[in-house]
């Protein structure tokens, strides 16, 4: 166990494993989607660049009452080095563009698959 900030935290998950698990969860969401995901909630689109994990969570954190993305939100928190608050916006948000959560998840999934293929795990 590693001691971090007063907690005995679990040993770090290898980034490749964490990324693969996030991809698998996003695949699971897109494949099991029957009704509109999160009741068709809209979120801010983001630029899929460095820092996108925090930006993605900043967008998704504003979606309330959507059990389908709870696991995704938890996984994204593991990639984001700082605590994200509702209503917080990073420079990566495309501020005038909102998309449905389902589309957001699909876009994120495509980008993460590309990163995984290229070996960019962090």
């Amino acid at each position: 166990l590693t001691c971090l900030g007063g907690f005995a935290s679990p040993g770090p998950v290898p980034p490749s494993t964490a990324l693969r698990e996030l991809i698998e969860e996003l695949v699971n969401i897109t494949q099991n989607q029957k009704a509109p995901l999160c009741n068709g909630s809209m979120v801010w689109s983001i630029n899929l660049t460095a820092g996108m994990y925090c930006a993605a969570l900043e967008s998704l954190i504003n979606v309330s009452g959507c059990s389908a993305i709870e696991k995704t939100q938890r996984m994204l928190s593991g990639f984001c080095p700082h605590k994200v608050s509702a209503g917080q916006f990073s420079s990566l948000h495309v501020r005038d563009t909102k998309i449905e959560v389902a589309q957001f998840v699909k876009d994120l999934l495509l980008h993460l698959k590309k990163l995984f293929r290229e070996g960019q795990f962090n």
Epitope: S67, K71, R74, S77, P81, K83
Partner: nanobody
Amino acid sequence: QLVESGGGLVQPGGSLRLSCAAPRFTLGSYAIAWFRQSPGKEREWVSCISRSGGDTIYSDSVKGRFTISRDNAKNTLYLQMNSLRAEDTAVYYCATDKRSFCYAPEGLGKGWTYDYWGQGTQVTVSS
């Protein structure tokens, strides 16, 4: 804000069920985590359950022995602890950050913190 109960003295191999209640807010609206702290050690994350109950996660040290669950009608969260060992002896705390999702265990201590805690309940595993 949170109140734990159900601790006590139990023999190795025995079981206990801890409860976490919140008199002042609706536990069913939030993800809840359990932590524990034994004398002279850092507080250790144990388990977490999301608001819907669809995401439950456990530390490797308790996986397969502990089960986290919730009864939203009773505004109560539970930690069922089976096959208890001496090393499970600790004060157990429940915590929330009034979010619907659990925080990734690897993020704890790196800025991802829970802001609402109980006072803890003592669990002692000894013959």
